[in-house]
């Protein structure tokens, strides 16, 4: 999902000045940042969330928080310390005048400012709802009662826990951080305080309509009786969540945050550290009918992100707007006309519509998965929801169409069997950030934590670019690609793996002096090619066309154009097996894909040869697309020739585990 | 552990009221409501209807005909059940039941209705 | 209203013998039924829920089974302390309603 610079706006202040005589200056060259939302009407200024440096102890925080207080009262500010955050992020909220940035920013340990911003409930119309007939008939889905081993933490409005589809699955915990309702003469009436809630609460447990019919509740109220909230307030719900889970560590955690706002990055990172504690988080997209990387926390890439479809697995239209869509969106579930409890009374239900339906019908699934297979991590929580999806469902024409290819056409389901896929080799496709237009702009995908980068790719639009390569970055393996002079930009797509045990390194061959171009295979004895990638400096491969020939009985050896580099991703696991599989039209085409077998995933998807015309070539489930130019453009010349490339891998050790256990 | 304790048994005039208490302890209070549920003497078990802690919100069986006050007091974890009118057809025991699923049961409070 | 029917209205058996207990609703209640065991000057106590479920406690002689509008309670291996009266509830639906009720007695 989001690299760490999303598209939000930021406003560096390099300040270098001394005043004031701090003990502890920041380190030299390195400058605080401060971030707002990038919605004007969202924003809430006068409250700050002063993030710190990660090893910043608690009792720091509050020397710090308090040598801003006293820096302010000399210059004449009333400051007030709203609350001081541990446990997840180190830093604290305040009240202050936006005057005091500036000296706020050179703070010891400060890392990041971020100006208080809100979030709302993703449900329309959540309280103008239409109301059904009290008696809802589900007599076509009775789901097995799932779910029973796991709590689901839901971060909404108040509910109405009593509700007869709920009675006694929902802990209501004394947490509450929301802002006053909007306008003078706001009325409160309880029903539809509770409606979001309620709803969402009971589409995840309830009785008769919920998916995980078993799985336990607690609420946190962080939206009002408007359905708004502050990311601050929702911050500080994640904290709460983490010291339970400190205090009382119980089973596997599902939060489910049917929430968004403008993007943030002390929201984004909050999330990161909840989720690399172990807990699974569940997010609606966003009812903007926009990219959702620009809001949070549908960004943050540890969240499970969830658009809406409806009934006929199209994307849901919500008045003038809709779901978002794009690259932040892991998967789409039903999301318009969802029966739920209704807060109107103890035994009605009513529909209602939107993407936190839609997450609140993964955050079940999950639920469920979960309770089967408590061990499951995050990774393998999101592959096996990606693998289990309904595929390529969804007209992508309801899309804008430079999103279409970005956004999964997965629509989630729940697994045949909730036990029994262990022996899968499951991958899955990471779109990057778009690189931008300038000469030298690259574009990085990564993989989460525990997953194998197995192989890496490149797209662009216009087709200027120069290729990719996988690099380390951190200790881990990153899919880079570049952009070239002239190009609108590149995406980098990396192949995503869970490959337990493995070994994987990048072998590189630098371009050729031949004719016959470049090759590299792997060489260590045991490993097994996952992924070939190319990378190329000169702006235009396309002025030599040598004929690039797959030497036969070479499946471990990439091959590629002779003024490219080229890279194997090369891996070795207790019983892993690939296989190179081709399909190559003689004639231009603008697609060309060939697909892997039943019992084969894909790893590698690379295009022959690596010129110009060729725009790319991505993973979309168990298929390689390499897309070329349009063919009007390039005529049918041989340049017009274009192969697909797919690696296709399996693990026998893995299925071998599996029938082990069965 | 979840216990819900009645109040005493009541003997009562027809045409007064009586008013019956159940408090709740050991669970939750606001993640279920009482329901109230009467027998009378060699008789099945009668619902009456239903009352939420979490917003004092009610639900009653239509027999009532608006004889029937069902309340909650969440600071005290106790439900209350007010009937008037009384007829001799009243005469029963009065049980407390948590949630609409009543998983649990008070321990019941003989109401006698007589002249 | 949804009426609740059950059958038999009593029955007479011996310690150790299998005795099944119906109950029929009169419209469909999915499975929002629950079983109660009553004993003389006693409050219920629930046996089953969600037509199907045991909580915590009760013996597994106990099952129920059954959907939608035919439901079914059976005791495996009828026990001394088994005598008592047996009632089905819907909850489906306001009011909830109880069956009439049925009386194990020893034969």
């Known amino acids: 999902q989001e690299d760490e610079d999303g598209d939000y706006e930021e406003l560096v202040l390099a300040l270098r000045s001394e005043e004031d005589g701090l003990a502890e200056a920041p380190e030299h060259g390195t400058t605080a940042t401060f971030h707002r939302c990038a919605k004007d009407p969202w924003r809430l200024p006068g409250t700050y969330v002063v993030v710190l440096k990660e090893e910043t102890h608690l009792s720091q925080s509050e020397r710090t928080a308090r040598r801003l207080q006293a820096q302010a009262a000399r210059r004449g500010y009333l400051t007030k310390i709203l609350h001081v955050f541990h446990g997840l992020l180190p830093g604290f909220l305040v009240k202050m005048s936006g005057d005091l940035l500036e000296l706020a920013l050179k703070l010891p340990h400060v890392d990041y400012i971020e100006e208080d911003s809100s979030v709302f409930a993703q449900s329309i119309p959540w309280n103008l709802e239409r109301i059904t007939p009290p008696r809802y008939r589900a007599d076509e889905y009775q789901p097995p009662d799932g779910g029973s081993l796991v709590e689901v933490y839901l971060l909404d409005t108040s509910i109405q826990s009593d509700h007869r589809e709920i009675e006694g699955r929902v802990m209501v915990t004394d947490f509450e951080n929301v802002p006053e309702e909007d306008g003078t003469r706001f009325h409160r009436q309880a029903s539809k305080c509770d409606s979001h809630g309620t709803h969402l609460a009971g589409v995840v447990s309830g009785r008769d309509a919920g998916v995980a019919k078993g799985a336990s509740m607690r609420s946190l109220r962080v939206l009002n009786c408007q359905g708004k909230g502050t990311v601050s307030g929702t911050l500080i719900g994640l904290e709460f969540i983490r010291k339970s889970q400190l205090v009382q560590p119980v089973g596997p955690l599902v939060v489910l945050l049917p929430l968004a706002g403008g993007y943030s990055r002390v929201l984004n990172a909050a999330c990161q550290r909840l989720a690399r504690a172990g807990v699974v988080l569940v997010t609606a997209a966003g009812n903007f009918r926009d990219d959702a990387c620009l809001y949070s926390p549908a960004s943050a890439p540890e969240v499970i992100t969830v658009g809406a479809t409806n009934a006929q697995d199209q994307p849901v239209t919500l008045g003038t707007l809709g779901t978002n869509f794009g690259r932040c969106v892991d998967l789409f579930a039903p999301g318009e006309d969802i029966i739920g409890a209704s807060s109107d009374c103890s035994t009605c239900f009513v529909s209602q519509s939107g993407t936190s339906q839609a997450a609140a019908h993964v955050a079940g699934i999950a639920a469920m998965m979960l309770s089967a297979e408590p061990e499951l991590t995050l990774a393998e929580l999101r592959q096996r929801l990606i693998h289990f999806s309904a595929k390529d469902v969804i007209n992508e024409a309801w899309f804008p169409e430079d999103q279409r290819v970005l956004t999964p056409n997965l629509v989630a389901a729940l697994p045949p069997s909730t036990h029994g896929a262990g022996w899968q080799l499951f991958c899955r496709t990471v779109w990057s950030a778009h690189s931008g237009p300038t000469r030298m702009a690259t574009a990085v995908a990564r993989c989460a934590p525990d997953e194998e980068l197995l192989s890496c790719s490149s797209f662009s639009r216009s087709g200027k670019r120069r290729g990719e390569r996988m690099e380390a970055q951190g200790g881990k393996l990153v899919c880079r690609a570049h952009n070239a002079f002239g190009g609108e930009g590149v995406y980098a797509i990396a192949r995503c793996c869970l490959l337990p045990q493995a070994n994987c390194s990048v072998h590189t061959a630098p371009p050729a002096e031949a004719s016959m171009g470049t090759r590299v295979h792997c060489h260590q004895q045991g490993h097994v090619l996952t992924g070939c990638s190319s990378h190329w400096e000169v702006e235009d491969l396309g002025t030599h066309k040598p004929p690039v020939l797959r030497p036969r009985g070479q499946p471990n050896q990439c091959v590629g154009h002779r003024e490219a580099s080229i890279h194997a991703s090369c891996c070795h696991a207790p019983g892993l097996e690939c296989k190179v599989k081709e399909h190559g039209i003689p004639a231009p085409q603008e697609q060309v894909t060939v697909a892997c077998e039943e019992g084969w995933t894909l790893t590698g998807c690379s295009a022959l040869p690596g010129t110009s015309h060729v725009l790319g070539a991505y993973a979309v489930d168990n298929t390689c697309v390499v897309r070329s130019r349009d063919v009007s453009t390039t005529g049918s010349t041989s340049e017009g020739a274009v192969t697909a490339v797919a690696i296709c891998c399996r693990s026998r050790h893995l299925a071998q585990a599996s029938q082990e256990l069965q | 552990q979840v216990q819900l304790v009645q109040s005493g048994a009541e003997v009562k005039k027809p045409g007064a009221s009586v008013k019956v208490s159940c408090k709740a302890s050991?669970?939750?209070?606001?993640?279920?409501?009482i329901s109230w549920v009467r027998q009378a003497p060699g008789q099945g078990l009668e619902w009456m209807g239903w009352?939420?802690?979490?917003?004092?919100?009610?639900n009653y069986a239509q027999k009532l005909q608006g004889r029937g006050t069902m309340t909650t007091d969440p600071s005290t974890s106790t439900a209350y059940m007010e009937l008037r009118s009384l007829r001799s057809d009243d005469t029963a025991v009065y049980y407390c039941?948590?949630?609409?699923?009543?998983?649990?049961w008070g321990q019941g409070t003989t109401v006698t209705v007589s002249s | 209203d949804i009426q609740m029917t059950q059958s038999p209205s009593s029955l007479s058996a011996s310690v150790g013998d299998r005795v099944t207990i119906t109950c029929r609703a009169s419209?469909?209640?999915?499975?929002?039924l629950n079983w109660y065991q009553q004993k003389p000057g006693k409050a219920p106590k629930l046996l089953i829920y969600g037509a199907s479920t045991r909580p915590t406690g009760v013996p597994s002689r106990f099952s129920g089974s059954g959907s939608g509008t035919d439901f079914t309670l059976t005791i495996s291996s009828l026990q001394p302390e088994d005598f008592a009266t047996y009632y089905c509830?819907?909850?489906?639906?306001?009011?909830?309603?109880f069956g009439q009720g049925t009386k194990v007695e020893i034969k």
């Open positions: 009352v939420s802690f979490y917003n004092g919100n009610s």
């Open positions: 509830q819907q909850w489906d639906d306001t009011p909830n309603t």
């Open positions: 039941a948590r949630g609409f699923g009543m998983d649990r």
């Open positions: 050991g669970y939750s209070l606001t993640s279920y409501g």
């Open positions: 419209q469909n209640i999915n499975n929002w």
